[in-house]
């Protein structure tokens, strides 16, 4: 899906508002500085990319975060904000939260939440120059 | 049983205020969109607005902007609906309609509809 | 922000077919799949009979299908019934300035 027609002010003040406590209640007990952040993201839309791709697609380690409340709230921002935001790939996230059978919270779990918080603080700052 | 279910009737003066409710029954009430979707006698739908109670996210048609508030209240799954400044115009049938879980636009459950009379 | 186009009126034998035609633009209908339709009975709450342009929910007569081209979505009403006496309302996600729209109705007469 390309994200250039997201309405991004209006995802940002969902993440302000509620995703982002979300992303703190999933981590809390980790310390800020246990992971380094290795993904990043150069603009809105590809920050928007990354953060649907580390979301919704199983990794080694971490089978799904999907059902997680961050990840609902995130899907339902995408679904009002992103005009024509696929229906493939609304479905196929919920294809993939019915075959999740129990949460665990996993090392590789948080690492990847962690990256995720790294992700929404680089869209909520995109006139920074990537580092 | 899956259902919404609004208050009664209401008739109201120009210029004022009306509040319908719709209790949802039977669903998970935070993840689904209410909307608002009104019918004048003899005439079509229209849009009101629609509120996710998930996101906390609320956005209402142009038209009504200012003079519509929807809110919802999760701990008992109840949808709300204050139209201001009431015209004779604003005389219709008031329904909530559930949005499909991240398809808010397709209204798959209905209230059974609120009638408004605005009159002097 | 004008309401979807449909034809006032339509009418079919039973037995018959009859197809109900809603055209947009390219914001709403044309830039998207997000088109639904709803059975009105007088006196009665809309019933989702439609969704995605061609999707029909579960308890919904395989009688009832849906297609787009273009600008246009259109709802084929096959082997009519005198229950399928009734408006019916075409719907359509518009962007995220709009986000929905409906058209005027169509009132569909079984003779």
């Known amino acids: 899906y390309d994200f250039t027609n997201c309405d991004f002010e209006k995802i940002k003040a969902a993440y302000l508002s509620t995703i982002s406590k979300d992303l703190i209640t999933y981590m809390s007990g980790t310390k800020s500085t246990e992971f380094n952040n290795t993904v990043s993201c150069s603009n809105r839309p590809h920050c928007l990319t990354e953060i649907q791709s580390l979301t919704f697609n199983p990794t080694a380690g971490c089978a799904s975060l999907a059902k997680e409340m961050f990840a609902m709230k995130t899907k339902a921002a995408l679904a009002i904000w992103c005009p024509g935001y696929s229906e493939t790939q609304i479905n196929a996230t919920q294809a993939m939260k019915k075959r999740r059978k129990r949460k665990v919270t996993t090392n590789k779990c948080l690492e990847q939440v962690s990256q995720l918080q790294g992700l929404w603080r680089r869209f909520n700052r995109p006139l920074l120059k990537q580092q | 049983q899956v259902q919404l279910v609004q208050s009664g009737a209401e008739v109201k003066k120009p210029g004022s205020s009306v509040k319908v409710s719709c209790k949802a029954s039977?669903?998970?009430?935070?993840?689904?969109?209410i909307s608002w979707v009104r019918q004048a006698p003899g005439q079509g739908l229209e849009w009101l607005g629609v509120?996710?109670?998930?996101?906390?996210?609320?956005i209402y048609a142009e038209k009504f902007q200012g003079r519509v508030t929807i809110t919802a209240d999760t701990s008992t799954s109840t949808a709300y609906m204050e139209l201001s400044s009431l015209r004779s115009e604003d005389t219709a049938v008031y329904y909530c309609?559930?949005?499909?879980?991240?398809?808010?636009?397709?209204?798959?459950?209905w209230g059974q509809g609120t009638l408004v009379t605005v009159s002097s | 922000q004008s309401a979807l186009t449909q034809p006032p009126s339509a009418s079919g034998s039973p037995g018959q077919s009859v197809t109900i035609s809603c055209t947009g633009t390219?914001?709403?209908?044309?830039?998207?799949?997000?088109v639904s339709w709803y059975q009105q009975h007088p006196g009665k709450a809309p019933k989702l009979m439609i969704y995605?342009?061609?999707k029909r929910p579960s308890g919904v007569p395989d009688r009832f299908s849906g297609s787009k081209s273009g600008n246009t979505a259109s709802l084929t009403v096959s082997g009519l019934q005198a229950e399928d006496e009734a408006d019916y309302y075409c719907?359509?996600?518009?962007?995220?300035?709009?986000?929905?729209?409906f058209g005027g109705g169509t009132k569909l007469t079984v003779l």
């Open positions: 039977g669903f998970t009430f935070g993840s689904y969109g």
């Open positions: 390219s914001s709403d209908i044309g830039g998207y799949n997000r």
């Open positions: 995605e342009f061609n």
């Open positions: 309609a559930r949005g499909q879980e991240y398809f808010y636009w397709y209204f798959d459950l």
């Open positions: 719907s359509s996600y518009a962007g995220t300035d709009i986000f929905v729209l």
């Open positions: 509120i996710v109670p998930l996101v906390g996210v609320t």
